[in-house]
Interface confidence: low
């Protein structure tokens, strides 16, 4: 029949709820074309009568609702003035009771049903609802482990669930629910989403940035105690070491015997895209030999130093 065959990925769908698939293939459907849907190589097109449970709505095939027996290969034929393409879509329908079993056991789920949140960041989940204009969708409700999600950290925004300050406990099975209205009838749409947590950040800069010190001198009296912080920003997934050195030697090693100058315990705070690390150096008692010597903070390939200097004499 001269039509070129294009095979799309399998779609795995839930029974007893609406489903729609749009026959779009941008290189083809951008011009003047006609679209016709068929099931299982049938010569008879899918009905265009809107009262039919399965019908074609413009370029869409719409199931109101989908039933277990609807599994199969559907074809949409796109005919242009000088071309013909047949797109094959394999639909697999399963009985799904969201609160009984985990969606994780299902094969080849699309990315719409597997989403990732980034630890320590503000992030979001998306409820994918693809339906023709004839379908009106009501407000979306979100559930985790079958309980409606409430709380300050969660905000529903159109088709998304915003999650602030993502924690490890946010992984698990989610579902988004909406009421779809079509030709005066209402149907429930319930999409399950398996959510995993990752620590990887999206920040582009891989070189750590030393915020402080900035290669400068510090005036300090002889014999006093001094603590200086080294503040470093770096990507969340970095493997850089941060430390203080003097004469190219770790301060803890250089002053191993006297322990007069020591490196502190590193702490960090998580920001939206990166961590801020702080590691201090403590001078228990500043001695003459410390003046003029660069004490270096190292963070990966980045370095910055402080130099201790005696305060200028006060002649007042």
């Amino acid at each position: 029949d001269g039509c070129k065959d294009i095979f799309m990925k399998n779609e795995i769908l839930s029974a007893s709820q609406p489903f729609a698939f749009n026959c779009t293939f941008p290189p083809i459907t951008s011009g003047e074309v006609s679209v016709t849907w068929y099931k299982n190589s049938s010569k008879i097109p899918v009905s265009k009568i809107i009262q039919s449970r399965i019908h074609q709505d413009e370029t869409w095939i719409l199931f109101l609702p989908m039933e277990w027996g609807d599994s199969g290969v559907y074809q949409c034929v796109i005919k242009g003035r000088d071309s013909c393409h047949r797109i094959h879509v394999n639909l697999t329908v399963f009985e799904k009771h969201w609160c009984d079993t985990s969606i994780g056991g299902l094969p080849n789920l699309s990315d719409e049903y597997k989403q990732i949140l980034h630890l320590g960041k503000d992030d979001s989940l998306t409820c994918h609802l693809h339906f023709p204009k004839s379908c009106v969708l009501g407000p979306i409700k979100w559930y985790k482990d079958c309980n409606e999600i409430k709380g300050e950290r969660f905000t529903v925004l159109e088709t998304r669930l915003l999650v602030s300050n993502v924690s490890a406990e946010d992984r698990g099975n989610y579902a988004c629910q909406a009421i779809l209205t079509h030709s005066g009838k209402q149907y429930e749409v319930l999409n399950g989403i398996t959510v995993s947590i990752t620590e990887r950040a999206g920040y582009g800069g891989s070189v750590p940035k030393i915020i402080y010190p900035k290669n400068h001198s510090i005036e300090v009296q002889l014999g006093t105690t001094l603590i200086v912080d080294c503040n470093v920003t770096d990507t969340k997934d970095n493997t850089n070491l941060r430390c203080w050195r003097v004469n190219n030697t770790l301060v803890d090693d250089y002053y191993d015997e006297s322990k007069r100058i020591r490196e502190g315990v590193e702490t960090h705070v998580s920001f939206r895209e990166h961590n801020l690390y702080t590691v201090n150096i403590t001078f228990l008692e500043v001695k003459m030999e410390d003046y003029g010597l660069p004490f270096m903070c190292h963070a990966g390939v980045s370095t910055a130093y402080i130099i201790l200097q005696l305060p200028a004499p006060d002649f007042r």
Epitope: Y203, G204, G205, K209, I211, N231, F271, R272, L276
Partner: antibody, heavy 120, light 106 residues
Framework: EVQLQQSGPSLVKPSQTLSLTCSVT??????GYWNWIRNFPGNKLEYM?????????YYNPSLKSRISITRDTSKNQYYLQLISVTTEDTATYYC??????????????WGQGTSVTVSS | EILLTQSPAIMSATLGEKVTMSCRAS?????MYWYQLKSGASPKLWIY???NLASGVPARFSGSGSGTSYSLTISSVEAEDAATYFC?????????FGGGTKLEIK
Amino acid sequence: EVQLQQSGPSLVKPSQTLSLTCSVTGASITSGYWNWIRNFPGNKLEYMGYISYSGYTYYNPSLKSRISITRDTSKNQYYLQLISVTTEDTATYYCATGGYDYVEDALYYWGQGTSVTVSS
Amino acid sequence: EILLTQSPAIMSATLGEKVTMSCRASSNVRYMYWYQLKSGASPKLWIYLTSNLASGVPARFSGSGSGTSYSLTISSVEAEDAATYFCQQFTTSPYTFGGGTKLEIK
């Protein structure tokens, strides 16, 4: 040097939509966070929201039903839309961003500000 | 929502005087940010991460604090310091600003 250049109308009628553009040079909006802040008469600052490097948006809950922040990465611009404005939305609107030098939360680079009056 | 209360709302200082302005948070804040605003200009980042001076900020300025109590100090006020200073928190959304402290020079 990062520069933010704002454009948009200075007068908007009540119930209409306020639309502002922030054009960014010296940095890509596909890195970092791109914020909108406004300053009401009498110097009261309000943080409105941001669009992130990935396109994720955060909106101040007090504005959530009326605000939209979008972007066009090909133009390196981001946008503010505030629908159904009232005279209470009269303010100077600023776009602003941080920068890796200042941790992205610190609002280091600011646009020149757009003074918007809502009046019929 | 974290409420940031700045005091005093307006303060007057003579040249060379040491001044301190306060910012109190209704609940714990991880870091405080300070901005300087002068009439007809855009705000400028002044202090970030509680105590770090932004580029170009004179060394006479300092920031300190933790938990719910933060402050900005000028060791010796100069005429160019006349401005309104705002504190801001990014710890908890919605992100909020204080009401500002207006510093006037006598």
